[in-house]
């Protein structure tokens, strides 16, 4: 569940994202389908970077609504082709 | 903490290729976007080129059908194979990686094209 990641990911704080956290990430995430609002939220809450660790067609699945979750920061490190993903998904959220 | 550090900057004649190569400190990481970037003399540093944890990459239009990323994992290398050099390719050349989150530089290299 969600709670579960937030709790792990509390127990992490402050350290750098370990590779079993990393694949744990990766796998809650393949198990929802897709990366919702509220596991956008968490994630960023707690790794500001991880979007610009996605490829842009991993960007491409996220859905426009979760991008409410982000913030101008969790975009720092994104290179141009994730950006040219994210832009338009924040575009059309912000429209609805 | 994971340090990067580019190797393979020199002079290079015009029409020639050249190969740039950026050692990763650590082999652990899980989720990644690995990049080259790019500053010449008085301009903005430049995005080149990714590649993603997924296996796939992307180039900026200036270096497309020029350039060419690559990560050999085995040996902790990222490389920059550069082909069809020209002047205005001259610059401090550095690797950046996202890895697991978190963005990391490395100190650059210096490539100019000249004859």
């Known amino acids: 569940s969600l709670e579960t990641l937030k709790a792990l990911l509390e127990v992490n704080k402050g350290h750098e994202m370990s590779p079993q956290v990393a694949t744990l990430i990766d796998r809650f995430v393949k198990g929802r389908g897709q990366l919702d609002k509220d596991t956008l939220d968490t994630l960023t809450a707690f790794y500001p970077g991880y979007l610009c660790s996605l490829s842009p067609e991993e960007l491409s699945s996220v859905p426009p609504s979760s991008i409410w979750a982000v913030r101008p920061q969790d975009l720092d490190t994104c290179d141009p082709r994730q950006l040219d993903v994210l832009y338009p998904k924040a575009r059309l959220a912000f429209q609805n | 903490q994971l340090q990067l550090v580019e190797s393979g900057g020199g002079l290079v004649q015009p029409g020639g290729s050249h190969r740039l190569s950026c050692a990763v400190s650590v082999s652990t990481f899980t989720r990644y976007a690995m990049r080259w970037y790019r500053q010449a003399p008085g301009k903005e540093r430049e995005w080149l080129t990714s590649i993603y944890s997924d296996g796939s990459s992307a180039y900026a239009d200036s270096v497309k059908d020029r350039f060419t990323i690559s990560l050999d994992n085995a040996k902790n290398m990222l490389y920059l194979q550069m082909n069809s050099l020209k002047p205005e390719d001259t610059a401090v050349y550095y690797c950046?990686?996202?890895?697991?989150?978190?963005?990391?530089w490395g100190q650059g290299t210096q490539v100019t094209v000249a004859s």
């Open positions: 950046n990686a996202n890895v697991d989150s978190k963005a990391y």
